[in-house]
Interface confidence: low
């Protein structure tokens, strides 16, 4: 069947379209077009012969149309008049006719569409807008985008006017955004340029920054008002009412308590026409003077004196604050505070308290601080140290002893000897020592604010003969498993060299055994029952040596998992039952036995003589290291029978 | 109609004292902001005083600060200029005038026909 | 203090003539500038206010312009009542004026 394509069907003004012949027949006379559904003399376009080869133009020819040979009809340069069908005639060689119509649309090439707006300074919560799509263009959809997406579904944003109206509706600062909109038809497609809504709006109540109100006296006052507002607001500052200026800022420098007050932001939109205020109120409180301590005693002594320290000036209903080493006051009963808190008072002074001490008076705004206080504690002589610690010398060394003792002011030193006063220096120094200067070695140490004297003796010996050594503990009865034990060798001497013996034989080689201190030291880690031994240490230096009396290791130890003997379970009836449990600890534990649950006595043995099937049941003993604190126990069944009844079984003690 | 009387001018010697009177009619005095503006002889115009129409908010301009008062009675619909310690760069004409309510913020708008202070010895 | 400087100080012309008369700030004032016209022996008028709005009763061939710091009054067609002193005034605080333009004719 012949039928007619367009292509395309769309046709864009200016361009070209082809109406395409389908199944035209072989042998034809000739054809022509029409414009129109029909066939129409006087609508005729181009008629065709093909016996002539001639072409025809007929009353609808433009001099736009092409003819071919296989009959489609090319239409140039295509204008919005040439819409609508066109009929091709079809005169084939018997002359029969026949007839088929195609159709194409044209449509303009959009041009860029643009917006208009009834309102270019709209109020917000007042204006409506209206956007309109310019031009107005037959066949055209119109789409709208706001910020490159499609419209979003509100109440307040209606399509009129076939999509060419987009109306906002009560317009909001949010509604601030880019409006394009776009012009579709099947030929093409044009989007305008953004057209940014300008919302007039505010100003906002004004916001008054920063939002401290309280200021000290001498500060700077630097006020900042900022309200929302479009166009930006003008603003202007009142202070108690009146007008001070028409500044986004206010700046007073070296405020005084005058400047307390009311003070307004006025915040003024020109295009709204709508003033905004916002008041704050400021208060300017005086500088109170810095704080600073007395105290009743500049130089108190330890254990014996109190301190009182006052937070100087008083000023009424002020609140008082104390540090102590820059920390809030301990919790003592050797510190009290007065009702006031401006007195802090220090019972017994020790030489921990020195210090250093703050107060402060807190005010609205923020806490002054007074400068630190140290307290000066007289305190000590403590007990004099000797050092070195050897009290073993060879003759011809140099003796060299210094003394120190703990004390404020700084102890004053004095020397005897075999209490014959030698000299009053920290260090006392004898060349070239000999037997003769073995004997008792006093130092005394004296505070002269203090009065007090403390003194520390020493036994030096001189010997080319080494002293027979002794063994020194810090745990005589080390718990196995839990402690350890450091034996040191006594005494300390120069040029020594220390040696230890365990059980006779030299260390053995172990993890737990560890020798410090120049030898001299020698500890045992997490002790065992095994370590109970005997431990010599010996001393020797190139002229002789000497051994220690041996020291026995007294491991406390257990008590561990009881044997309850015999180890049998059962008895005749009539048999007398004698239970003994035994259990390894040091020392010996306290025993104890429960029948059933139920306590019976604290004895090594259980006897129960002539036994009935009633003492059936379970025997349980326990067994208590008090030492250790450790407790242990065993459970055994017994089982009595009725005699004669089951061979084999035990006749009992 | 608007109208602003000043009163109270006159010739007064150096270190004295003169108190000049604004009497107002044809609008709401009571809620209004009112102002005394000067000009010395061949000068141009010097801002003095403004008062709110409460008479808590005063400002002065640095040359007469403490030493000139301005105030109001709203019942007599009168703004009062008090001067002391005269000196004689204080010669002027001053002129009472009105701050409207709107525009914002707003200039002076009405003015009275200004009384002569001399200040001489 | 802000400053107002106008110029020129002083200006001759004749009837029919476009007159500008400028206003400089020393630091920016919005738009809150005031223009003011004084007669010999008279108090002065406000003409504009908001540096751009004509004042209620003050004829059309008057306007301001301006923001910030600089600032115009433009007669646009000289009449023989307006030779005045001419003076700007910044609405800020304190309220200080120019120090004036006298008109005269030429």
């Known amino acids: 069947k012949l039928t007619i394509e367009s292509t395309p069907f769309n046709v864009a003004e200016g361009k070209e379209v082809l109406l395409l012949v389908h199944n035209l027949p072989q042998h034809l006379f000739g054809y022509s077009w029409y414009k129109g559904e029909r066939v129409d003399g006087n609508r005729q376009i181009i008629g065709y012969v093909i016996g002539t080869q001639q072409a025809t133009p007929g009353p609808a020819y433009s001099g736009r149309e092409i003819i071919y040979p296989n009959a489609s009809l090319l239409i140039q340069n295509i204008i919005q008049n040439d819409t609508g069908f066109y009929t091709l005639h079809v005169i084939k060689s018997d002359l029969v006719n026949e007839e088929a119509t195609g159709q194409f649309r044209v449509y303009p090439e959009l041009p860029k569409p643009s917006i208009s707006s009834n309102n270019s300074k709209p109020v917000e919560d007042k204006d409506a807008v209206a956007f309109t799509c310019e031009p107005e263009t037959q066949d055209a959809t119109y789409l709208w985008w706001v910020n490159n997406q499609s419209l979003p579904v509100s109440p307040r944003l209606q399509l009129s006017n076939g999509n060419r109206t987009l109306t906002l509706f009560n317009v909001t600062r949010n509604d601030t955004a880019s409006y394009k909109c776009e012009t579709q038809n099947p030929v093409s497609a044009r989007r305008s340029d953004s057209v940014i809504l300008n919302v007039l709006y505010g100003p906002d109540a004004p916001t008054i920054s920063p939002l401290n109100t309280s200021y000290r006296s001498g500060e700077n006052l630097n006020l900042s008002c900022h309200a929302a507002s479009n166009p930006p607001a003008q603003y202007s500052w009142f202070v108690n009412g009146t007008f001070q200026q028409s500044t986004q800022e206010l700046f007073i420098p070296n405020i005084t308590v005058n400047n307390s007050g009311s003070y307004t932001c006025q915040a003024h939109n020109s295009d709204t026409g709508l003033n905004r205020t916002t008041v704050t109120t400021i208060t300017v409180y005086a500088e109170p003077p810095k704080p600073f301590i007395t105290s009743n005693n500049s130089n108190p002594v330890e254990d014996e004196d109190a301190v009182a320290l006052t937070c100087e000036p008083e000023i009424q209903n002020t609140t008082y604050l104390w540090w102590v080493n820059n920390q809030s006051l301990p919790v003592s009963p050797r510190l009290q505070l007065s009702n006031d808190n401006r007195t802090l008072t220090l019972l017994s002074v020790t030489r921990n308290d020195v210090g250093p001490y703050e107060c402060g008076i807190q005010n609205e705004l923020s806490v002054d601080h007074s400068d630190p206080v140290i307290l000066n504690v007289l305190y000590g002589p403590d007990d004099p140290t000797i050092s070195p610690s050897y009290t073993y010398y060879r003759p011809g060394v140099n003796l060299s002893l210094s003394c120190h003792a703990a004390s404020n002011p700084p102890a004053q030193y004095s020397w005897l000897i075999d209490g014959n006063i030698q000299q009053h220096t920290q260090e006392l120094f004898i060349s070239n020592i000999t037997e003769k200067n073995s004997g008792l070695y006093t130092c005394q140490a004296n505070n002269s604010a203090s009065g007090h004297s403390r003194t520390t003796v020493k036994t030096i010996t001189v010997s080319a003969e080494l002293p027979k050594p002794s063994i020194s503990s810090n745990n005589s009865k080390p718990v196995e498993d839990k402690d350890a034990v450091a034996f040191t060798c006594e005494p300390e001497a120069q040029n020594t060299t220390y040696l230890w013996w365990v059980n006779g034989q030299s260390l053995p080689v172990s993890p737990r055994l560890q020798l410090s201190n120049g030898n001299r030291t020698l500890t045992l880690f997490n002790v065992t029952r095994n370590d109970a031994r005997a431990y010599v240490c010996g001393i020797q230096n190139s002229v002789s040596a000497n051994r220690s009396d041996p020291v026995t290791l007294d491991v406390l130890y257990g008590p561990d998992t009881p044997i309850i003997s015999p180890p049998d379970s059962s008895y005749l009836s009539g048999a007398n039952l004698n239970l003994s449990c035994h259990s390894a600890s040091n020392p010996s534990p306290q025993y104890s036995w429960r029948i059933n649950g139920i306590p019976q006595q604290h004895t090594q043995v259980l006897f129960i003589a002539k036994i009935t099937p009633n003492n059936n049941g379970t025997y349980a003993c326990f067994v208590s290291n008090l030492a250790t604190g450790r407790n242990n126990s065993i459970v055994k069944s017994i089982t009595v029978s009725a005699s004669g009844t089951s061979p084999g079984l035990s006749a009992g003690a | 109609e608007v109208q602003l009387l000043e009163s109270g001018g006159g010739l007064v010697q150096p270190g004295g004292s003169l108190r000049l009177s604004c009497a107002a009619s044809g609008f709401t005095f009571s809620s209004s902001y009112m102002g005394w503006v000067r000009q010395a002889p061949g000068k141009g115009l010097e801002w003095v005083s403004s008062i709110g129409s409460g008479s808590y908010s005063t400002s002065y301009a640095d040359s007469v600060k403490g030493r000139f008062t301005i105030s109001r009675d709203n019942s007599k619909n009168t703004l009062y200029l008090q001067m002391n310690s005269l000196r004689a760069e204080d010669t002027a004409v001053y002129y009472c005038?009105?701050?409207?309510?709107?525009?914002?913020?707003?200039?002076?708008?009405?003015w009275g026909q200004g009384t002569l202070v001399t200040v001489s010895s | 203090d802000i400053q107002m400087t106008q110029s020129p100080s002083s200006l001759s012309a004749s009837v029919g003539d476009r007159v500008t008369i400028t206003c400089r700030a020393s630091q920016s004032i919005s738009s809150y500038l005031n223009w003011y016209q004084q007669k010999p022996g008279k108090a002065p008028k406000l003409l504009i206010y908001a540096a751009s709005s004509l004042q209620s009763g003050v004829p059309s061939r008057f306007s301001g312009s301006g923001s910030g710091t600089d600032f115009t009054l433009t007669i646009s067609s000289l009449q023989p009542e307006d030779f005045a002193t001419y003076y700007c005034?910044?609405?800020?605080?304190?309220?200080?004026f120019g120090q004036g333009t006298k008109l005269e004719i030429k």
């Open positions: 005038a009105r701050y409207p309510s709107v525009p914002f913020p707003p200039p002076l708008d009405y």
């Open positions: 005034q910044q609405a800020g605080n304190p309220h200080t």
